[in-house]
Interface confidence: medium
Amino acid sequence: MMTGTIETTGNISAEKGGSIILQCHLSSTTAQVTQVNWEQQDQLLAICNADLGWHISPSFKDRVAPGPGLGLTLQSLTVNDTGEYFCIYHTYPDGTYTGRIFLEVLESSVAEHGARFQIP
């Protein structure tokens, strides 16, 4: 029986050229998390495997950074990044839990000055 719940950052917005953290948290279950997949619509962004660590898809490696935690940081945002993002928790013995985040990237007159941040 799947008892867990996922809390996410929900519907979020950011400016073109900026950065954003996508975050999910799985609670209310003792199941072991074996892997977390981050997907945008049908594209795989990144995988965090309990044994193998992080893998960032080659097409996103310049703009995606792992963390914090099991979250994902997107940098140098473009309007094309607008859309649905999913955190998919693979657990044992429960199975799969999925959280949804909707990101809207907005045009800005100061977008060229958009800050980036680093995760130490």
Partner: nanobody
Amino acid sequence: EVQLVESGGGLVQPGGSLRLSCAASGRTFSFMGWFRQAPGKEREWVASVLRGGYTWYADSVKGRFTISADNSKNTAYLQMNSLKPEDTAVYYCAKDGGWFDPWGQGTLVTVSS
């Protein structure tokens, strides 16, 4: 218009404590975070909190800083203990785990004897 107002900074001796506050107006946020920028350095992420109370910290502050949020006041806090000179920076809060340009004024934290 969304506004984020940071406060609580100041001068403190190494080993001391400060509590920063970030008051948000405009709407309720499910995710808030703190960032900092030291002189001559890139702005870096410090900590984040989800509305349900789940928290994440940069390794450099883990065990010393505590982030929290009062949903009824739409305010986020950063309790900073065992401060070190390398914590000296302007601290900014951000909504939704990201930010809009331009940033707010931030609040300056100086750790020095």
